[in-house]
């Protein structure tokens, strides 16, 4: 289970209409459910139940986003529509280039994601918890554009690859 280095860049629009960027670094873990690959895209927050809709229709929104899912306590969802792995698969089917799970309230999900899968996803599935998860969710919950860049080695220059 390798460390995933995640850079999150928040884009704040300035009075002139340009963007000011703020970069936050945090760490998670690549799970065995997905590939240990770098990935980058706009963050899209997904509610766990939002991944339950099983219609196979693609919508008109763009591909290449990074899905962020805050998992709830198991007691709040005793009969989930999909396993955690199933939710990751559903997000990738809908165009996610990577999925990040906040497992702070559902640490059991770590074992589920790390059970050896015969058919692991070809995109990274990362989990974060604790202070890193709090930092991530604080950014995700803002009504602002944010991009995530996931790497499997520490970043050299934080903002080098980001442009809008």
């Amino acid at each position: 289970k390798e460390t995933a280095f995640v850079e999150v860049v928040l884009f704040e629009s300035s009075p002139s209409g340009d963007y000011t960027t703020y970069t936050t670094g945090l760490t998670g873990r690549f799970s065995r459910a997905g590939a240990t690959l770098s990935a980058e895209g706009e963050i899209v927050q997904m509610h766990p139940l939002g991944l339950c809709n099983n219609n196979d229709e693609e919508d008109l929104y763009e591909y290449g986003w990074v899905g962020v899912v805050k998992l709830e306590q198991p007691e709040l969802d005793p009969k989930p529509c999909l396993t955690v792995l199933g939710k990751a698969k559903r997000a990738v089917q809908r165009g996610a280039t990577a999925v990040i799970f906040d497992v702070s309230e559902n640490p059991e999900a770590i074992d589920q994601l790390n059970q050896g899968s015969e058919d692991p996803l070809k995109r990274p599935v990362v989990y974060v918890k604790g202070a890193d998860a709090i930092k991530l969710m604080n950014i995700v919950n803002k009504q602002k554009v944010a991009r995530a860049r996931i790497q499997h080695r520490p970043p050299r220059q934080p903002t080098e690859y980001f442009d809008m």
């Epitope: 706009e42 927050q45 693609e58 008109l60 929104y61 763009e62 591909y63």
Partner: antibody, heavy 117, light 113 residues
Framework: EVQLLESGGGLVQPGGSLRLSCAAS????????MSWVRQAPGKGLEWVSG????????YYADSVKGRFTISRDNSKNTLYLQMNSLRAEDRAVYYC??????????WGQGTLVTVSS | DIVMTQSPDSLAVSLGERATINCTSS????????????LAWYQQKPGQPPKLLIY???TRASGVPDRFSGSGSGTDFTLTISSLQAEDVAVYYC?????????FGQGTKVEIK
């Protein structure tokens, strides 16, 4: 630089057909849903049709369902709108637009379709 | 289909004054997954294609000056131009892109008084 260039507009008789094209450049075309939006002279905007990034799913306004067909060729970075059984009320400037979670962020300059006998 | 209704149809405002446009949707455009309102505002000047101004009901698009602001949630939304400039004369449209078919409001023409 993102560019969308529509073509294929022109004069057609009622009941006739026309095929519009939209050539896209400056972005990864097969990562984005695309739409056609039209505007009749002096009127407002009307969303006509949309297609998902892969082309697997298509969507239509009720006013064109069964008459218009949206398609795309991701190898050619091109979006199409096949318009059959054209009516006088289809007369409009037709725009293609790139779809995102931020709405339609880039638009072409439009191509005029005139339906008249 | 979601019906979008704008008011007023036209608006005449003095230079430097505030212009306010309202938009109501027939059902909520709040996206259940990410809690964002899939509501955009566009500006269209004569002979030009529309230009994206605001998305997620309140976030300014790149290059849009801060005199333009959006607010609202669920079914009721507002576009405000805090200090009207000559270059803001245009027709403004709201659009829901929450569910297909996407739909626009009928437009509001903003002129200088």
């Amino acid at each position: 630089e993102v560019q969308l260039l529509e073509s294929g507009g022109g004069l057609v008789q009622p009941g006739g057909s026309l095929r519009l094209s939209c050539a896209a450049s400056g972005f990864t075309f097969n990562n984005f849903g695309m739409s056609w939006v039209r505007q009749a002279p002096g009127k407002g905007l009307e969303w006509v049709s949309g297609i998902s990034a892969s082309g697997r799913n298509t969507y239509y306004a009720d006013s064109v369902k069964g008459r218009f067909t949206i398609s795309r060729d991701n190898s050619k970075n091109t979006l199409y709108l096949q318009m059959n059984s054209l009516r006088a009320e289809d007369r409009a400037v037709y725009y293609c637009a790139r779809e995102t979670r931020h709405g339609s962020d880039y638009w072409g300059q439009g191509t005029l379709v005139t339906v008249s006998s | 289909d979601i019906v979008m209704t704008q008011s007023p149809d036209s608006l005449a405002v003095s230079l430097g004054e505030r212009a306010t446009i309202n938009c109501t949707s027939s059902q909520s455009v709040l996206h259940s997954s990410n809690k964002k309102n899939y509501l955009a505002w566009y500006q269209q000047k004569p002979g030009q294609p529309p230009k994206l101004l605001i998305y997620w009901a309140s976030t300014r698009a790149s290059g849009v000056p801060d005199r333009f602001s959006g607010s609202g949630s669920g079914t009721d939304f507002t576009l405000t131009i805090s200090s009207l400039q000559a270059e803001d004369v245009a027709v403004y449209y709201c659009q829901q892109y929450h569910s297909t078919p996407y739909t626009f409001g009928q437009g509001t023409k903003v002129e200088i008084k």
